[in-house]
């Protein structure tokens, strides 16, 4: 049989950040290779990563077609000797289907992790500081242009700002559903800033890690009277 001595994949796991999406699995192949298929709940299977010896497959190109769809992937274990005859031999020399394992379902819009945000700039004018969060580009496209995280999530995405005087430990917080904060500060004081992204409507993967801390007096800032 064409499926002898193949080991079914296991521990299929989606790894996704800002819609960059990779399916990972085990085990490392011995005398076999893998082919991955992906589909929406109602769609046809599409094959990716043909006859690979990797234990991961980048499925970003497929899931960004509609990030609100729910996707299912499956990983086929194909005997090494069958993988050298071209794509038509996926189902073995006698036409039987090789063993495969299904992934968990994955809905990118609800499940992709939020990447660590970056403070793009801050500008002080008198006792006000405008803090701007970089609007990271994703691999999601519309009309042939890549969308930013804000384009994709709209007001579903909130940024929380933590800020504090360099000279004290007491923190304050503010939030925005744009990418800009305008906060009051004490004149003559230096402040430090960190931001976190949040998707309020989610129940899991709701928050990003905190951005790197940026402090006034460093190069990202600008001061005007």
């Amino acid at each position: 049989s064409g499926t002898t001595n193949t080991v079914a994949a296991y521990n299929l796991t989606w790894k996704s950040t800002n819609f960059k999406t990779i399916l990972e699995w085990e085990p490392k192949p011995v005398n076999q290779v893998y082919t991955v298929q992906i589909s929406t709940k109602s769609g046809d299977w599409k094959s990716k990563c043909f006859y690979t010896t990797d234990t991961e497959c980048d499925l970003t190109d497929e899931i960004v077609k509609d990030v609100k769809q729910t996707y299912l992937a499956r990983v086929f274990s194909v005997p090494w000797r069958n993988s050298t005859h071209g794509k038509e031999t996926l189902f073995g020399t006698h036409g039987e289907e090789p063993p495969y394992e299904n992934s968990p379902e994955f809905t990118p819009y609800l499940e992709t992790n939020l990447g660590q945000p970056t403070i793009q700039s801050f500008e002080q004018v008198g006792t006000k500081v405008n803090v701007t969060v970089e609007d990271e580009r994703t691999l999601v496209r519309r009309n042939n242009t890549f969308l930013s995280l804000r384009d994709v999530f709209g007001k579903d995405l909130i940024y929380t700002l933590y800020y504090w005087k360099s000279s004290s430990s007491g923190k304050k917080t503010a939030k925005t559903n744009t990418n800009e904060f305008l906060i009051d500060v004490d004149k003559g004081e230096n402040y430090c800033f960190s931001v976190q992204a949040v998707i309020p409507s989610r129940t899991v993967n709701r928050k990003s890690t905190d951005s790197p801390v940026e402090c006034m007096g460093q190069e990202k800032g600008e001061f005007r009277e």
Partner: antibody
């Protein structure tokens, strides 16, 4: 289902300390911001502070900074409010609440604290 | 810090009346304003979030409006079960602040 249950309230003498707990079930506290709010008898609601249990960030109303400390034990899915140097005016019902970033969507039933000699 | 001035502090109305409560912020709070209902001995219950959005399961007679510094909460037709104290909360920046509350009674 989501539930928050406060405990640890009671009668305490002025100058003493008290630690309140808020046990969460039906969700992981590290996925949310968590708050403490209090209400003195016959008075309005007063925000004490918040914690992001995932990274330990805490924010307080300045009037409570230094005397009250919010912490969390993610392994026990529990929020804490450590209150030191208690005063009679700290007599109130203390609530914990979950914050989804647009609103506080779940509140505990409250635990009463009386500061009296 | 942002101050929230809520008015009136109490009001009396009849069943079926239209009831309006206002909250004025000391600075722009960018619609980060919620309205809560609290009945004696109970925790507050969310009615309106982001100034105008009705919370799940809340009757449509409750509504909110406003932006910038001025916000309004309306009950279009007062029902007996609406007897409670109502609070606004700004959460745009810390310290978060509640209005003083409006105690609603039925005449």
């Amino acid at each position: 289902q989501v539930q928050l249950v406060e405990s640890g309230g009671g009668v305490v003498q002025p100058g003493r300390s008290l630690r309140l707990s808020c046990k969460a079930s039906g969700f992981n506290i590290k996925d949310y911001y968590m708050h403490w709010v209090r209400q003195a008898p016959g008075k309005g609601l007063e925000w004490i502070g918040l914690i992001d249990p995932e990274n330990g960030n805490t924010i307080y109303d300045p009037k409570f900074q230094g005397r009250f400390t919010i912490s969390a034990d993610n392994s026990k899915n529990t929020l804490f409010l450590q209150m030191d140097s208690l005063r009679p005016e700290d007599t109130a019902v203390y609530y914990c609440a979950r914050d989804n970033s647009y609103y506080f969507d779940y509140w505990g039933q409250g635990t009463p604290v009386t500061v009296s000699s | 810090d942002i101050q929230m001035t809520q008015s009136p502090s109490s009001l009396s109305a009849s069943v079926g009346d239209r009831v309006t409560i206002t909250c004025k912020a000391s600075q722009d709070i960018r619609k980060y304003l919620n309205w809560y209902q609290q009945k004696p001995g109970k925790a507050p219950k969310l009615l309106i979030y982001y100034a105008t959005s009705l919370a799940d399961g809340v009757p449509s007679r409750f509504s909110g409006s406003g932006s910038g510094t001025d916000y309004t909460f309306t009950i279009s037709s007062l029902q007996p079960e609406d007897i409670a104290t109502y609070y606004c909360l700004q959460h745009g920046e810390s310290p978060y602040t509640f209005g003083q509350g409006t105690k609603l009674e039925i005449t």
